[in-house]
């Protein structure tokens, strides 16, 4: 279970027409659902529900966006209509590439994630807890133009202050 | 409790560089929260001058942008802010908190006096 | 940027009283607006995050409210410690802004 190193780009457009942005970088784990390679797209939240739709012609979005589901407790939903790992496999085959999932409420979910498949999925799944989790779900509640881009090794930064 | 403590000289030169530490006690900079500096004017005003992500990505007040650098020590636990050029507008309360943008800012250090004059 | 106008500027009330304070934002907020306290020794704690949500260890008189750009701070029954300055701060658009303070004084 390698950390998944997510850094997310938050676009926000004035009155005049330029924009600035907002950089922050939050950290979760790649799940053996999936695979762990880099991914990058524009934000995209999905409720757990809205994945049981079986008409994807209803819910298609452009490809190469990254999913972001907030898992709710399992007693909100006791018979739910696919298992995490089904919800990763709808989300990816509507075009995700990536899925990120908020398992804060439900912790269950990263055993089920980590099981291990015989046919994982070719592009990441991470789960996020904790403060990250937070701050993902922070980002998305903004309402703004977002990008991620899910990495297996930390970015560069210049930030760091080294004692010599 | 969380506790964050700022230290740094009291007085600087016009023109020179301001430089603060802020020290962070039970957490870890690393954590997943966002690391701010806010200052305090004389007359109440506040302004959010940048923050530092537990990642190591830095954002800043556009209105400081040329000036600004927020830095960190991890191995530390600590953060930094070195704001050049200053002049006597720059004299205010600095206080470094945990918190930014995507974060309320839930816990402040008590603040440090930085006066700017010859 | 985001201009954050709170009012009134100095507000003197006794114990016991309600109280309200206002913040009003120069852009819609979609309710991303926190309140803090600035006691008179410089120390400063969150009261609320997201319009009306209190902070841990926040007492329930406290409350908030509003949308849109319209928002404010209440306080139903004052106590000795709550005079004190008081600060709005929106991060709904980015930077972060404050509002210029409410001083709350002792009639």
């Known amino acids: 279970k390698e950390t998944a190193f997510v850094e997310v780009v938050l676009f926000e457009s004035s009155p005049s027409g330029d924009y600035t942005t907002y950089t922050t970088g939050l950290t979760g784990r790649f799940s053996r659902a999936g695979a762990t390679l880099s991914a990058e797209g524009e934000i995209v939240q999905m409720h757990p529900l809205g994945l049981c739709n079986n008409n994807d012609e209803e819910d298609l979005y452009e490809y190469g966006w990254v999913g972001v589901v907030k898992l709710e407790q399992p007693e909100l939903d006791p018979k739910p209509c696919l298992t995490v790992l089904g919800k990763a496999k709808r989300a990816v085959q509507r075009g995700a590439t990536a899925v990120i999932f908020d398992v804060s409420e439900n912790p269950e979910a990263i055993d089920q994630l980590n099981q291990g498949s015989e046919d994982p999925l070719k592009r990441p799944v991470v789960y996020v807890k904790g403060a990250d989790a937070i701050k993902l779900m922070n980002i998305v509640n903004k309402q703004k133009v977002a990008r991620a881009r899910i990495q297996h090794r930390p970015p560069r930064q210049p930030t760091e202050y080294f004692d010599m | 409790e969380i506790q964050l403590q700022e230290s740094g000289p009291g007085l600087v030169k016009p023109s020179q560089s301001l430089s603060l530490t802020c020290s962070v006690t039970d957490d870890t900079i690393t954590s997943g929260y966002d690391w701010s500096w806010i200052r305090k004017f004389p007359g109440n005003k506040m302004e959010w001058m940048g923050d530092?992500?537990?990642?190591?990505?830095?954002n800043y007040n556009p209105s400081l942008q040329i000036r600004i650098s927020i830095t960190r020590d991890t191995s530390k636990n600590q953060f930094f802010l070195q704001l050049n050029s200053v002049t006597t507008e720059d004299s205010a309360t600095y206080y470094c908190?945990?918190?930014?943008?995507?974060?309320?800012?839930?816990?402040w250090g008590q603040g440090t006096l930085v006066t700017v004059s010859s | 940027d985001i201009q954050m106008t709170q009012s009134p500027s100095s507000l003197p009330a006794s114990l016991g009283e309600r109280v309200t304070i206002s913040c009003r934002a120069s852009q819609v907020l979609n309710n991303n607006l926190n309140w803090y306290q600035q006691k008179p020794d410089g120390t400063i704690k969150p009261l609320l995050y997201?319009?009306?949500n209190l902070q841990s260890g926040v007492p329930s008189r406290f409350s908030g409210s509003g949308s849109g750009t319209d928002y404010s701070l209440t306080i139903t029954s004052l106590d000795p410690e709550d005079f004190a300055i008081y600060y709005c701060?929106?991060?709904?658009?980015?930077?972060?802004?404050f509002g210029g303070g409410t001083k709350l004084e002792l009639k």
């Open positions: 908190a945990r918190g930014g943008f995507l974060f309320p800012f839930t816990f």
């Open positions: 530092i992500s537990s990642s190591g990505h830095t």
């Open positions: 997201y319009t009306s």
């Open positions: 701060q929106q991060d709904a658009s980015f930077p972060p802004t």
